[in-house]
């Protein structure tokens, strides 16, 4: 936890962050708690970010105040304000840009004191890997394709009977930048399967980590997916 | 209840200025979760965002109008206001003034619009 | 700037039967989209924000879904008063732009 300190005889008020991440071109939040006060209009949230001049998002007396925004924020920040009350001071940023990466701080005044917090914003792009059976492949082979991660992830193929094998050599994947010239189509292909075993396909960058199952059978094909975000820590 | 009241000369001569206000009644400018945006439609087609300020001045417009385009807003007043420079036939068209949400940015409530119409 | 297709250009329907419009995003635009209902000599009036919220005062039978590029505006039991031009709008990225426009008209 980071305590702001008393100033002007007010008491240090406690403020929790949240490092997360933000997949760009989606809406994402950054997360900020604050000790609540029963009155809204005592209540000022103050949103800044290292390295720019104006404030990415303030709200006081009940209301935004975004007269001292920058313009990089412009249009694309809202607090939950019907939250405020119980000390929910969580940002909504829209449309999440690589440049949006960096450090934030949530700064809170209230009657009972002042307090702060800082946050590591991490920003890429992720998305959950869908896997099918490759209909092209002359033999019985695996397709894995995530439409758009950012930074160039990894991707390793396992599987549940050969826990310890190493797929690199009977597996192909690329990576096709998308239109908007920033993030990219994830596209591998495991060849020579065996039936009745699962394989799963894993894709990794330093900002999430996303997984596709599948188990190919005689009868039905079965399919699991699973995305993880990393390193979302409280301060 | 928040109204929005366009005013302006409805004809309007090539290369010269257009000059509309916006009033806004029933509520104050000041109020800190919105902008205060134009939009235009020519004659039986769709609608096109002009640009949006903030009470404290600040603006945002749509790059392909940039060049031409000052939206001021008068705080005592409850007012805001277009000017649109060098216009052609093809400015011609009905102006609205709308209240825009800070995020979500939806138009609500529109003004009831004025045609202006561009014409020696 | 992100280009908003709308689909069909013109609905006919019969009263009383359901109305199904689409918006199609160049890109994605999450789910910040809005819709507008437009009647001859008004102006536009929002319907629904946020690709899925009604906004304040509108009917039940108005309802907004989808996310990403696709987009879709159901008005359930259509009532004389929908008779109107459905506007569609991407709020996701400066400039913001509307879609074409869909006239709904009686069948």
């Known amino acids: 936890f980071i305590i702001g300190f008393g100033i002007s005889g007010r008491h240090s008020i406690t403020v929790t962050t949240l490092t997360s991440a933000g997949n760009i071109g989606e809406d994402g939040i950054l997360s900020c708690t604050f000790e609540p006060d029963i009155k809204l209009s005592d209540i000022v949230i103050q949103w800044l970010k290292e390295g720019v001049t104006g404030l990415v998002h303030e709200f006081k007396k009940g209301k935004d105040d975004l007269s001292d925004q920058d313009e990089m924020f412009r249009g694309r920040t809202a607090v939950f304000a019907d939250q405020v009350i119980v000390g929910n001071a969580s940002l909504r940023l829209k449309n999440v840009q690589l440049t949006d990466a960096g450090t934030y701080k949530c700064y809170i005044i209230t009657s009972k004191g002042k307090g702060n917090a800082k946050l590591e914003y991490k920003t890429g792009a992720f998305s959950i890997p869908e896997v099918n059976v490759d209909s092209n492949a002359s033999s019985e082979s695996l397709r894995c394709e995530a439409p758009r991660w950012f930074p160039q992830p990894t991707v390793v193929w396992a599987s549940q009977v050969d826990q310890g094998a190493n797929f690199s050599e009977v597996s192909n994947t690329s990576f096709e930048l998308n239109p908007e010239n920033v993030t990219m189509k994830v596209v591998s292909v495991l060849y020579n399967v065996t039936i009745n075993t699962t394989y799963s396909c894993m894709i990794e960058n330093d900002i999430a980590k996303a997984t596709g199952d599948i188990r190919v059978t005689d009868s039905e094909i079965k399919r699991q997916s699973h995305l993880q975000l990393l390193n979302s820590k409280a301060s | 209840q928040l109204q929005l009241q366009e005013s302006g000369p409805g004809l309007v001569k090539p290369s010269e200025t257009l000059s509309l206000t916006c009033t806004v009644s029933?509520?104050?400018?000041?109020?800190?979760?919105?902008?205060w945006g134009w939009i235009r439609q020519p004659p039986g087609k769709g609608l096109e965002w002009i640009g949006n300020?903030?009470?404290?001045?600040?603006?945002y417009y749509n790059p392909s109008l940039r060049s031409r385009v000052t939206i001021s807003v008068d705080t005592s007043k409850n007012q805001f206001s277009l000017k649109l420079s060098s216009v052609t036939a093809a400015d011609t068209a009905v102006y609205y003034c709308?209240?825009?949400?800070?995020?979500?940015?939806?138009?609500?409530?529109w003004g009831q619009g004025t045609l202006v119409t561009v014409s020696s | 700037e992100i280009v908003m297709t709308q689909s069909p250009a013109t609905l006919s329907v019969s009263p009383g039967e359901r109305a199904t419009l689409s918006c199609r995003a160049s890109?994605?635009?999450?789910?910040?989209l809005a819709w507008y209902q437009q009647k001859p000599g008004q102006a536009p009036r929002l319907l629904i924000y946020?690709?899925?919220t009604r906004a304040t005062g509108i009917p039940a039978r108005f309802s907004g879904s989808g996310s990403g590029t696709e987009f879709t505006l159901t008005i359930s039991s259509l009532q004389s008063e929908d008779f109107a031009v459905y506007y569609c709008?991407?709020?996701?990225?400066?400039?913001?732009?509307f879609g074409g426009g869909t006239k709904v008209e009686i069948k």
């Open positions: 709308a209240r825009e949400g800070s995020y979500p940015n939806q138009f609500d409530p």
């Open positions: 029933g509520g104050s400018i000041k109020s800190g979760s919105y902008y």
């Open positions: 300020i903030y009470y404290s001045g600040s603006t």
């Open positions: 890109q994605s635009v999450s789910s910040n």
């Open positions: 946020g690709a899925s």
């Open positions: 709008q991407q709020y996701h990225s400066f400039p913001f732009t």
